[in-house]
């Protein structure tokens, strides 16, 4: 922390400008009025201050606003935002999407920092839900943002916001997250026709139940293998060979290359070998002819 010393004669800053880069840290502390800094924060961005000088400027703002900065200052923080700690940010009340965008821009191209995560958390909590405009903004800066949320947090995403989600935004989502997002997507896209619906819902299908996959198999969707491999194993297992053939269409041939991987491997083990042979792909490992299959889980449920 910089010692309190009187400002040398003639050095009192009348405005925030480039002459301040020639000030030593103690001179900045002594000669820059915090209220002046707060009203001219937008100028700081255009001046190549050292990180040490930025520390002094931040200290002055902290003294002026011990309870947290007002949004008028936050919006113009620019690269001073990188000096903020999550504890600083928790004191803020950020309500404007423009402010959020301005601060995300500062961190653009970098991984999501703890500061950014805290900022987003404060913003979303302040809004009460993850609305479409916010989601649009966040996924534009951080394609993986959606998958960084817990299932509980995802439950606050309204179905209307799902329109903002791009396939790449879901790349790192796990099944628990897709379980929450899929019903919302189904609701959001329910009024679309078959082929358009499939294009939109495809990235969310990792959360789809068996009955929805059965319904899709009746619609000539030609699901690609990459999508099929991301389906829930428990949703794929009850599908018949005929249903999988209809679901995949011409892509059914790709099953051979994936026969050792889930969910294909587990699905093969549940099918009659006779039925698998009808595909003509040489898939092995099905239930031999003449064997009786007992579904023990069903029996346990009944007893």
């Amino acid at each position: 922390e910089v010692e309190k010393t009187a400002c040398p004669s003639g050095k009192k800053a009348r405005e925030i400008d480039e002459s301040l880069i020639f000030y030593k840290k103690w001179e900045l502390e002594a000669c820059v009025d915090a209220a002046l800094l707060a009203t001219q924060m937008d100028r700081v961005n255009a001046i190549p201050f050292t990180y040490e000088q930025l520390d002094v400027l931040k200290h002055k703002l902290d003294e002026l606003y011990p309870q947290g900065y007002p949004e008028s200052v936050i919006q113009h923080l620019g690269y001073l935002f990188l000096k903020m700690s999550p504890e600083d940010i928790r004191k803020w009340n950020v309500t404007s999407l423009e402010t959020l965008k301005a601060l995300l821009e500062v961190n653009k191209g970098h991984e999501m920092s703890p500061q950014v995560a805290t900022l987003i958390d404060r913003f979303v909590k302040g809004r009460g839900q993850l609305d479409k405009d916010t989601l649009d903004t966040l996924t534009a800066f951080y394609p993986g943002y959606l998958c960084s949320l817990s299932p509980e947090e995802l439950s606050s995403v309204p179905p209307s916001s799902i329109w903002a989600v791009r396939p790449q935004d879901l790349d790192t989502c796990d099944p628990r997250q897709l379980d929450v997002l899929y019903p919302k997507a189904r609701l959001a896209f329910q009024n679309m026709n078959g082929s358009e619906y499939f294009v939109k819902i495809q990235s969310f299908l990792g959360g789809a139940p068996t009955e929805d996959l059965k319904a899709l198999s009746q619609q000539n969707v030609s699901m690609d293998l990459a999508t099929f491999m991301k389906l829930r194993t428990d949703a794929v297992l009850p599908l018949t060979v005929a249903e999988v053939q209809k679901l995949l269409g011409p892509h059914v041939e790709g099953l051979k290359a994936e026969e050792r991987h889930r969910p294909v491997r587990d699905w093969i083990l549940r099918q009659r070998q006779d039925d698998l042979d009808t595909l003509g792909l040489g898939l092995q490992g099905g239930i031999p002819n003449g064997y009786l299959v007992l579904d023990l889980s069903m029996q346990e449920a009944l007893s």
Epitope: N45, A46, I47, P48, T50, Y79, F81, E105, V106
Partner: nanobody, 117 residues
């Protein structure tokens, strides 16, 4: 995306050096540039400044009349011409770029060493 300084070296008192600050991976046109120096064990201090257009320049009192800052946007480079060098000018010189017009990016170079002895 980085700034690379060059032109430093060992020079006798009264001699001259010309430092260069070249941008790699981005265009300097929209950036104000500052030259800073840090002597061993001392605080880093501002030496010179040039606006993005080149229309405005500024200098620390200790170098006024001896140092001249200029820019060649076509070459994506800013220069610091240092004349009448003194032993107290010794230090590591680095340049910094700050974005104007709401561009929040800022870049620092690694520095080039100047020894006046």
């Amino acid at each position: 995306l980085q700034l690379v300084e060059s032109g430093g070296g060992l020079v006798q008192p009264g001699g001259s050096l010309r430092l260069s600050c070249a941008a790699s991976g981005f265009t300097l046109d929209y950036y104000a540039i500052g030259w800073f120096r840090q002597a061993p064990g001392k605080e880093r201090e501002g030496v010179s400044y040039i606006s993005s257009s080149g229309g405005s320049t500024n200098y620390a009192d200790s170098v006024k009349g001896r140092f001249t800052i200029s820019r060649d946007n076509a070459k994506n480079t800013v220069y610091l011409q240092m004349n009448s060098l003194k032993p107290e000018d010794t230090g590591v010189y680095s340049c910094a770029a700050a974005g104007c017009y709401g561009n929040s990016s800022r870049y620092w170079g690694q520095g080039t060493s100047v020894t006046v002895s």
